[in-house]
Each structure stands twice: as structure tokens, then as C-alpha cells.
């Protein structure tokens, strides 16, 4: 039986050109996390696998950084980054848990959750 729940940062907004931390947390289960996928609509951003570490999708590799924890930091935001993001936790023996985050990228200075990652 799947007892776990996914907690996410929910609906968040950030400033164009800024950065944002996408975070999900799996709680209320002792299931082992074997992999976490981060997706934007139907597009894969990143995977963190228990045995293979992180893989960042080539189309995002220059502006996505792993962390904090199993979260993801998205840099150099554009209005095209507005939309739904999903964290998909693959666990054993429970199965798959999915969390949803809605990001709105704003033209004005209303950034939240600014990250401290820097991509040289």
C-alpha cells in the first residue's frame, strides 16, 4: 500500500533572468527512493538515480543545477519557463509518487526562492 505523500513548493513565481529552486519532499513512507525524475510538461529536465547519480537533459545543461538535496535549481529564467513542473519519485516497494509545481516567470521584480547557484 502506498502511504507516502509528496510535499512541494506549490505555486511559485520568479523574476525573468533570475533563478528558482524546485523542491519536492516525499514523506510518510519508509520506501527506498531509487530514482527521481524532474519533468516540465512532457520534457525531461533531469534524473537523479541511486546508482548513476545525476543526468541533466542536454537542452537544459547550461542552466540547471542539482540541489539542494534532490531538488533542482533552474537559472536564467525566461517567460517560456512558465508552466507545470513534476517531480517523479520512483520508490521500492511503493512504486511511483508524483508532485506538481507551477512556476510563473514574471517580468517584474517579484522573485521568490532565489537560489545561490552560479553557473560560470
Amino acid at each position: 500500500m502506498m502511504t507516502g505523500t509528496i510535499e512541494t513548493t506549490g505555486n511559485i513565481s520568479a523574476e525573468k533572468g533570475g533563478s528558482i529552486i524546485l523542491q519536492c519532499h516525499l514523506s510518510s513512507t519508509t520506501a527506498q527512493v531509487t530514482q527521481v525524475n524532474w519533468e516540465q510538461q512532457d520534457q525531461l529536465l533531469a534524473i537523479c538515480n541511486a546508482d548513476l547519480g545525476w543526468h541533466i537533459s542536454p537542452s537544459f545543461k547550461d542552466r540547471v543545477a542539482p540541489g539542494p538535496g534532490l531538488g533542482l535549481t533552474l537559472q536564467s529564467l525566461t517567460v517560456n519557463d512558465t508552466g507545470e513542473y513534476f517531480c517523479i519519485y520512483h520508490t521500492y516497494p511503493d512504486g511511483t509518487y508524483t508532485g506538481r509545481i507551477f512556476l510563473e516567470v514574471l517580468e517584474s521584480s517579484v522573485a521568490e526562492h532565489g537560489a545561490r547557484f552560479q553557473i560560470p
Partner: antibody
Framework: QVQLQQPGAELVKPGASVKMSCKAS????????MHWVKQTPGQGLEWIGG????????SYNQKFKGKATLTADKSSSTAYMQLSSLTSEDSAVYYC??????????WGQGTSVTVSS | QIVLTQSPAIMSASPGEKVTMTCSAS?????MYWYQQKTGSSPRLLIY???NLASGVPVRFSGSGSGTSYSLTISRMEAEDAATYYC?????????FGGGTKLEIK
């Protein structure tokens, strides 16, 4: 097997800089974050910052911004941390540690830095 | 930043005795991680995601907790368990460690 090799010790003068290395082997260097942790008897373990060698992205503990600079060389699978303007407060053991899905699952043996004239 | 407070700072236990140490967070964290450090060695990951044993860790170790309160338990103390144990949060920057619990053998 995963290994993180660090030099044993560095003796440096006050005001100078030091660049310490952490050579990784036994895994894909560009697929894991590499963190640096300071250990002193008084302050315990402190996270300095981390780097993702896949794209060079860095994150710093605000306390160590301006003090530490993290870099990584993909060709040699080596992470580096440079500490600048050293004082006696910087005398400590510095560890590198990799992280993936399981937090900091492998640690180097640590580099002992002594700042003394 | 999230402050982790470990207690007790120092404790001793006899072989075969049950040992429990705690880690309290200043604000809620999703998971806790525990590391063991023996004198002269680097820290070693002991428990990840609050309750899962890292590779090669004896089953006498266990972790539990949620929110702001976490604990590490050794069901039957052995001489080789004498070490300092640190908790760590990995949920938000900056990552922080507890001050450590030094466990000695009686």
C-alpha cells in the same frame, strides 16, 4: 570502487592562499555533486559549498563566500577548493564528499590545513 | 539557516546496551542523515532518508523521526561503535550538521 583522494596536509602562511585537490575515481565524475566540508574542534562540521562538475554550477554557504572558490577539472576528474587570505581561523581539516541520491555517501580522507608564520 | 541540536553531547554505554541519541531541527526538515566518525578518520554515511541503512552498515543501527525531531538508535552497543555521530539536513541551503554526539564505550 569509489575513491576520493586528498593530500594529507598543507602548511601555509597567514595572508596567503591555498588550493587543495580532490581526485575522484570509480564513478562518473560529472554525474555527482562534490561538496567541501570544514572540520574544526570548536565548530564541528560546516558545509562550505558544492560544485556540479557536469556544468560547473556552484553553491556556497554564505559564510564562506569570498573565502572559498570551487572549481572542477573534468579531464582529470579532480575537484579543487581555493581558500584565500588565510588566517588562523582557517586552520582545519577540509573534506571533499560526493553526493547523489544518498546525500554525502563518500568522503575523502581530508586535508589538514595549518596557517602559521 | 536550519540549526541542528544533538543530545546528549557525550554519552557512554556498555557492550550490549541499547543506545539512543537525538537530533532536533530548528525548523521542519524532510529527511535526516546520520554520519559516524571515528577518531582520525573521515565521516561515513550511516543512515540516509531518516531510516535507511547505508551500504555495509550493521542492522543494529536504526533511524527514525519526522519534522523537527529525529533519533539514531543502536540496539546493542559494540566496542567498534565508539565514535562521534553527526546528523545532517540536506533539504535547504546551507546544508547544516549537528554538533555531534560522542559515544564512548564503558
Amino acid at each position: 570502487q569509489v575513491q576520493l583522494q586528498q593530500p594529507g596536509a598543507e602548511l601555509v602562511k597567514p595572508g596567503a592562499s591555498v588550493k587543495m585537490s580532490c581526485k575522484a575515481s570509480g564513478y562518473t565524475f560529472t554525474s555527482y555533486n562534490m561538496h567541501w566540508v570544514k572540520q574544526t574542534p570548536g565548530q564541528g562540521l560546516e558545509w562550505i559549498g558544492g560544485i556540479y562538475p557536469g556544468n560547473g554550477a556552484t553553491s556556497y554557504n554564505q559564510k564562506f563566500k569570498g573565502k572559498a572558490t570551487l572549481t572542477a577539472d573534468k579531464s582529470s576528474s579532480t575537484a579543487y577548493m581555493q581558500l584565500s587570505s588565510l588566517t588562523s581561523e582557517d586552520s582545519a581539516v577540509y573534506y571533499c564528499a560526493r553526493s547523489g541520491l544518498r546525500a554525502m555517501d563518500y568522503w575523502g580522507q581530508g586535508t589538514s590545513v595549518t596557517v602559521s608564520s | 539557516q536550519i540549526v541542528l541540536t544533538q543530545s546528549p553531547a557525550i554519552m557512554s554505554a556498555s557492550p550490549g546496551e541499547k543506545v539512543t541519541m537525538t537530533c532536533s531541527a530548528s525548523s521542519s526538515v524532510s529527511y535526516m542523515y546520520w554520519y559516524q566518525q571515528k577518531t582520525g578518520s573521515s565521516p561515513r554515511l550511516l543512515i540516509y532518508d531518516t531510516s535507511n541503512l547505508a551500504s555495509g552498515v550493521p542492522v543494529r543501527f536504526s533511524g527514525s523521526g519526522s519534522g523537527t525531531s529525529y533519533s539514531l538508535t543502536i540496539s546493542r552497543m559494540e566496542a567498534e561503535d565508539a565514535a562521534t555521530y553527526y546528523c545532517q539536513q540536506w533539504s535547504s541551503y546551507p546544508y547544516t550538521f549537528g554538533g555531534g554526539t560522542k559515544l564512548e564505550i564503558k
